[in-house]
Amino acid sequence: LWMHKVPASLMVSLGEDAHFQCPHNSSNNANVTWWRVLHGNYTWPPEFLGPGEDPNGTLIIQNVNKSHGGIYVCRVQEGNESYQQSCGTYLRVRQPPPRPFLDMGEGTKNR
């Protein structure tokens, strides 16, 4: 069992969904779990989040906000063998840019 490389970082806008892949070469029903190292608290033990969503072990986090920031790590286990762990993907949550003034309706501008 071995893991493919994962992206070092993922940037998602506030309120959007984050999709994390956990590519591995297991052909069997590998068990994928996801863990998070909290942003700004890297000495704390990784936090258990839960299983992957599909046979590929994708993690989907809906409606992300700033507190979702951190490093997301997947672990893959086949049977009772020791698990393999990804290097982790750093989630950065981006504030969407404000709408430019010119986007406003003419009525709003003239008020």
Partner: antibody, heavy 116, light 111 residues
């Protein structure tokens, strides 16, 4: 502070239905797989059902499979358990819980009584 | 999905040490070491005492310790105190988002 608040319990007749809710606050709810765990009077803890963070994966104990449905509304930070075809042996306190690792959170539970 | 096996009851005098065992199969425990121990007083929700086999959450007394060897996990309480009298449950991750609990052990503090 993390809070999980269950509601929806009560007295129901055998064969009846009930829907439990669990309102979560103080945690990044959408990140976590969530679970329902029950405890019959004077008995031990029993895992009932679990759901992945986005709701794409659902899991059930054999004792409730085909009768209970777990779901979540991530826009409302709420977990649900729809219980149909209830039996006397489903009588228990039902806890909403995020299990595993150091971030392990439980509600105070809601009592479901199935009796005629 | 059969329960993990725990002794129904254990007892000890104040100041003594006791150990509660929790036995399962290799599929119950896997290699993730996601084994937790809970303390439950009557009418209360379970309280996490040990996570990932041997780690103590902040705020839990260092009189509580956990270990795991093969398919058996153990909880040891040293320097027994009256307030330790409660029910204790082990719990293990069993893949997907499924979990299995032990049947529970009633701890009696004598005298």
């Amino acid at each position: 502070e993390v809070q999980l608040l269950e509601s929806g319990g009560g007295l129901v007749q055998p064969g009846g239905s009930l829907r439990l809710s669990c309102a979560a606050s103080g945690l990044t709810f959408t990140s976590y797989a969530m679970n329902w765990v029950r405890q019959a009077p004077g008995k031990g803890l029993e895992w009932v059902s679990g759901i992945s963070g986005s709701g794409g994966g659902t899991y059930y104990a054999d004792s409730v499979k085909g009768r209970f449905t777990i779901s979540r509304d991530n826009s409302k930070n709420t977990l649900y358990l729809q219980m149909n075809s209830l039996r006397a042996e489903d009588t228990a306190v039902y806890y909403c819980a995020k299990l595993g690792g150091w971030s392990d959170y439980w509600g105070q539970g809601t009592l479901v009584t199935v009796s005629s | 999905q059969s329960a993990l096996t725990q002794p129904a009851s254990v007892s000890g005098s104040p100041g003594q040490s006791i150990t509660i065992s929790c036995t399962g199969t290799s599929s119950d425990f896997g290699s993730y070491n996601l084994v937790s121990w809970y303390q439950q007083h009557p009418g209360k929700a379970p309280k996490l005492m040990i996570y990932e086999g041997s780690k103590r959450p902040s705020g839990v007394s260092n009189r509580f310790s956990g270990s795991k060897s093969g398919n058996t996990a153990s909880l040891t309480i040293s320097g027994l105190q009256a307030e330790d009298e409660a029910d204790y449950y082990c719990c293990s991750y069993a893949g997907g988002s499924t979990w299995v609990f032990g049947g529970g052990t009633k701890l009696t503090v004598l005298g």
